[in-house]
């Protein structure tokens, strides 16, 4: 309940935000989950706080893992978890799901993309916008303070944007890119009963204990603008939130993608430092409309680690 | 500059609910909480409940539990408090005001009128 | 829950005269983790929004005029309005920042004579 999700890259700048609020004269305390071992405050540090913020500047792989905030209030400390994945940088042009921000969707009207979670870092404009990691240019653009405008929206404009700024902290310059899809809003449309694309129903996923893994539920409900139209896992059977394994969240925000004209979800699950008693759960993705439900099942099994003989 | 923007004033039949909504601009949304508070004609100010805009959860005053919900929609920088189950003695003005050192902002407050 | 209660609930002063406002809560508002007093004082004319004055017993919030000053810890508070003016004329509220429920005093109406 009081845990959040946050990612980022290796060698750029990550700054977490403490899921509990209080007010700004509150203290605020940061524990590192795994070794109980308080963050620094001080500014010296590649990782410290600050107050409410947590700053990797910059993160690196070895990073990942839960951090505890407390907020300390005159009558109760307020605890929160802060579940922060560090990846490696890809070399080719695709971005993954699970460095996917919420999806956006604008329409001729309205064609507004924010960029995601740049409220939290010292940038100044302007900001860089790339569409499928090509540079946007042309006069249809508009980077205006936070947020990208695209005049005249076609339906062509679809597709994952990214935006990248520069964060500064006491003088030195931090790179950050965060990536959203944008979808076009499609005034004709339909609705199925849900087709689950992944996984497969009866899937085996091969993990590896100690590290991380990500499962995607990703369904299509149709064409066009779905009104009701949902993703999401369970465990054995109960809603994430109340299985209460911090160590498990699914992504916040769902990813609206218009492939093949369809209306699709995904909702990716995240499981930080695999446990054995992992493998025993079961996991249920769900999608569902007005017009019903479905539901594939996923077990993990262990990956074998593959002998190599020179 | 911060500004906070309330929906308009109501009229109520006894037994019914009502909804007011708050729209928050000229800061980011998620970074303070959000705080409900009444004021009866007359009457001195009467905190309502308040809401983790971050996260979403909600804390409620024991004078309003199981009757008041507060929530808040984040893609529009709006939180909302439904009163259900009104009386007549709900009848008051309904302000938002943001979570800080004291409420430095508030909403121009709404006005709910129960009577049948 | 803390009460708060103030005092008196009405006064009538002339123009530039001293006033002062007392606040009393039924538990102390100071938090000993920062040494902070969780106490506001709220002015709020008849129709209007209420504004904030006065946070932590005794900081005053930024474009207040300098002849409103707040004082006090644990659980006595006071606000003074060193030179009153015509434009002061309203219902002054302490408040318990402290914890929740956040509870407000009865209020003090100030008139001028």
């Known amino acids: 309940k009081f845990s959040k999700q946050s990612w980022g890259l290796e060698n750029e700048a990550l700054i977490v935000r403490c899921p509990r609020q209080g007010k700004p004269s509150y203290t605020v305390d940061w524990y590192y989950s795994q070794t109980n071992k308080s963050i620094p405050t001080q500014e010296r540090n590649r990782v410290f706080a600050s107050g409410q913020l947590l700053k990797f500047l910059p993160a690196a792989v070895a990073d990942s893992g839960i951090y505890t905030c407390i907020v300390r209030s005159p009558t109760f400390n307020r605890t929160g978890y802060a579940n922060v994945t560090i990846y490696k940088k890809q070399s080719d042009c695709n971005v993954p799901d699970y460095l996917m921000y919420s999806t956006v969707s604008g329409s001729e009207k309205n064609s507004k993309i924010y960029c995601p979670t740049i409220d939290l870092y010292n940038w100044t404009a302007p900001l860089e916008w790339f569409k499928n990691c090509q540079a946007l240019q042309g006069s249809r653009y508009r980077a205006h303070k936070s947020f990208l405008v695209i005049d005249n929206v076609m339906t062509e404009d679809a597709g994952d944007y990214t935006c990248k700024f520069i964060h500064n902290e006491n003088g030195a310059n931090y790179s950050v890119t965060a990536t959203r899809s944008f979808t076009v809003k499609d005034e004709q449309g339909f609705s199925l009963f849900p087709v689950i694309g992944a996984p497969a129903q009866n899937e085996i996923k091969e993990v590896e204990i100690g590290k991380n893994a990500n499962l995607t539920c990703s369904a299509c409900f149709g064409k066009g603008t779905q009104f009701l139209a949902a993703v999401l896992w369970q465990l054995n059977g109960t809603k994430i939130t109340d299985f209460g394994e911090p160590r498990i969240q699914q992504e916040e925000g769902q990813n609206q993608s218009f492939s093949n004209g369809l209306a699709c979800l995904d909702m990716v699950l995240r499981i930080a430092d695999v446990k054995e008693e992992d493998l025993l759960l079961q996991y249920d993705c769900l999608a569902l409309n007005l017009h019903g439900l479905r539901r594939h099942t996923v077990r993990l099994s262990r990956k074998n680690p593959i002998d190599h003989h020179s | 500059q911060v500004q906070l923007v309330q929906s308009g004033a109501e009229v109520k039949k006894p037994g019914a609910s009502v909804k007011v909504s708050c729209k928050a601009s000229g800061y980011t949304f998620i970074n303070y909480g959000m705080n409900w508070v009444r004021q009866a004609p007359g009457q001195r100010l009467e905190w309502m409940g308040w809401i983790n805009t971050y996260i979403g959860e909600p804390t409620y005053g024991d004078n309003f539990k199981g009757r008041v919900t507060i929530t808040r929609d984040t893609s529009a920088s709006t939180a909302y408090m439904e009163l259900s189950s009104l009386r007549s003695e709900d009848t008051a003005v309904y302000y938002c005001?943001?979570?800080?050192?004291?409420?430095?902002?508030w909403g121009q407050g709404t006005l709910v009128t129960v009577s049948s | 829950d803390i009460q708060m209660t103030q005092s008196p609930s009405s006064l009538s002063a002339s123009v530039g005269d001293r006033v002062t406002i007392t606040c009393k809560s039924s538990q102390s508002l100071l938090y000993s983790g920062n040494q902070n007093n969780y106490l506001a004082w709220y002015q709020q004319k008849p129709g209007k929004v209420p504004k904030l004055l006065i946070y932590g017993a005794s900081t005053r919030e930024s474009g207040v005029p300098s002849r409103f000053s707040g004082s006090g810890s644990g659980t006595d508070f006071t606000l003074t309005i060193s030179s009153l003016q015509p434009e002061d004329v309203a219902t002054y509220y302490c408040q318990n920042d402290h914890s929740y429920p956040y509870t407000f005093g009865g209020g003090t109406k100030v008139e001028i004579k």
């Open positions: 005001a943001r979570e800080g050192e004291g409420f430095a902002y």
